[in-house]
């Protein structure tokens, strides 16, 4: 009975001229992997990794397909023609054959650079804006509190000519910093400090096949 499942890197994108790692991982089975075949969209062979014979790279791809990491495959010098489906076929004993699918989209350098240039800085800009707003609110709150303490001091001094209308608005002031903290925490989930190592150490991420971050960090898979 085949109990295993193939986990793949799913839908990935990379820029023209760059490189990308294709990775499949067989889990939930004790079966021994005897061979892994990598095929392209038209089912033409890219490479084979045999447990006893090592790697066989299809000759036409020898100069731009690198074996590994692990049972995966690295495609280099990507062209627009590389866009499409890729399949990993695991021959195992005693289970038999498992198959996984990856879709690779190769983006024009200008498009990739555009999205890289504007998408990530946009997150940065938003984070910066939130920080600026937070600082501004904090400054307002601090100044307001200073004014309050000055007024209290004035009352004690017998100067009671000011009304307390302004002071009634002060309790609502601590609310923005609270929402600001939540807003600041959100970008950290998008490859911020908490997942910085995962984003930076791309190759380690694929070797370990830690899929926990795939949903939140779609640009992990690009190694251009």
């Amino acid at each position: 009975m085949m109990t295993g499942t193939i986990e793949t890197t799913g839908n990935i994108s990379a820029k023209k001229g760059g490189s990308v790692i294709l990775q499949c991982h067989l889990s939930s089975t004790m079966a021994q992997v005897t061979q892994v075949n990598w095929e392209q969209h038209d089912h033409s062979l890219l490479a084979i990794r045999n447990a006893e014979l090592g790697w066989h790279i299809y000759p036409a791809f020898k100069d731009r397909v690198a074996p590994g990491p692990g049972l995966g495959l690295t495609l280099q010098s990507l062209t627009m023609n590389d866009t499409g489906e890729y399949f990993c076929t695991y021959h195992t004993y005693p289970d038999g054959t498992y198959r996984g699918r990856i879709f690779l989209e190769v983006l024009e350098s200008s498009v990739a650079e555009h999205s890289a240039r504007f998408q990530i800085p946009l997150l940065g800009a938003m984070a910066m804006m939130l920080v600026v707003i937070c600082i501004a609110v904090i400054v307002v709150v601090v100044l307001a509190r200073k004014k309050k303490s000055l007024r209290i001091h004035s009352v004690e001094s017998g100067l009671q000519r000011k009304s307390t209308g302004q002071e009634e608005q002060i309790p609502s002031a601590p609310s923005p910093p609270g929402s600001c903290v939540q807003a600041e925490a959100a970008p950290a989930g998008l490859c911020g400090e908490q997942q910085g190592d995962d984003c930076a150490e791309l190759h380690d991420y694929f070797n370990v096949l830690s899929y926990r971050s795939l949903g939140s960090c779609s640009f992990f898979t690009e190694t251009g």
């Epitope: 045999n50 006893e52 014979l53 066989h56 020898k62 054959t97």
Partner: antibody
Framework: QVQLVQSGAEVKKPGASVKVSCKAS????????MYWVRQAPGQGLEWIAF????????TYNQRFRGKATLTVDTSISTAYMELSRLRSDDTAVYYC????????????WGQGTLVTVSS | DIQMTQSPSSLSASVGDRVTITCRPS??????LSWYQQKPGKAPKLLIY???SLPSGVPSRFSGSGSGTDFTLTISSLQPEDFATYYC?????????FGQGTKVEIK
């Protein structure tokens, strides 16, 4: 067209070594592995080893570890197999063959080199 | 090691005959099997790879089939130049091994 031309017949004494060459032409040498197979007189085919001409890495049949050593000279598109500590049962025709496009089979063969080990 | 058992070891046939040679590996090799033809004093020549694929230049009267542990080489209509010895070879593990050969002789 793809061609593999092997060096000529050799007669060696037991304990000696021999180096057989295989000159490739008609294709990009480094894109394929080179295989070596032997055939004793009147016998079947026996795979010895192959070498990846791109990386220089070799994979051997365990039976021939310490007996055969494979090398390549990419500048002249030539593969070599050196056989050491020759014995009379090493007498055979030795073939080089270019690996296949789609796996570990033998696509194009050289004409063979007869190595005779005799005292 | 994967043992390759070919049968028959020899056969006699006439020009125009349909000839079938079988090869049985000792374990599952999926479709990683090739066939070679060797004439006396000559180097072997690739006939079939991956169980059923024909390299360019090989006549279409040669065909291969099978998977797992049972493979067949068929010559649909034997020609005078087909009298030779045929070998199967697996390419699924180390060591790569060949069958002992099937000699096709003129009846």
């Amino acid at each position: 067209q793809v061609q593999l031309v092997q060096s000529g017949a050799e007669v060696k004494k037991p304990g000696a070594s021999v180096k057989v060459s295989c000159k490739a032409s008609g294709y990009t040498f480094t894109r394929y592995s080179m295989y070596w197979v032997r055939q004793a007189p009147g016998q079947g085919l026996e795979w010895i080893a192959f070498i990846d001409a791109y990386s220089g890495g070799s994979t051997y049949n365990q039976r021939f570890r310490g007996k055969a050593t494979l090398t390549v000279d990419t500048s002249i598109s030539t593969a070599y197999m050196e056989l050491s500590r020759l014995r009379s049962d090493d007498t055979a025709v030795y073939y080089c063959a270019r690996g296949g496009d789609y796996g570990w089979y033998l696509g194009v063969w050289g004409q063979g080199t007869l190595v005779t080990v005799s005292s | 090691d994967i043992q390759m058992t070919q049968s028959p070891s020899s056969l006699s046939a006439s020009v125009g005959d349909r000839v079938t040679i079988t090869c049985r590996p000792s374990e599952n090799i999926y479709t990683y099997l090739s066939w070679y033809q060797q004439k006396p004093g000559k180097a072997p020549k690739l006939l079939i790879y991956n169980a059923k694929s024909l390299p360019s230049g090989v006549p279409s009267r040669f065909s291969g089939s099978g998977s797992g542990t049972d493979f067949t080489l068929t010559i649909s209509s034997l020609q005078p130049e087909d009298f030779a010895t045929y070998y199967c070879q697996h390419h699924y593990g180390n060591p790569l091994t060949f069958g002992q050969g099937t000699k096709v002789e003129i009846k």
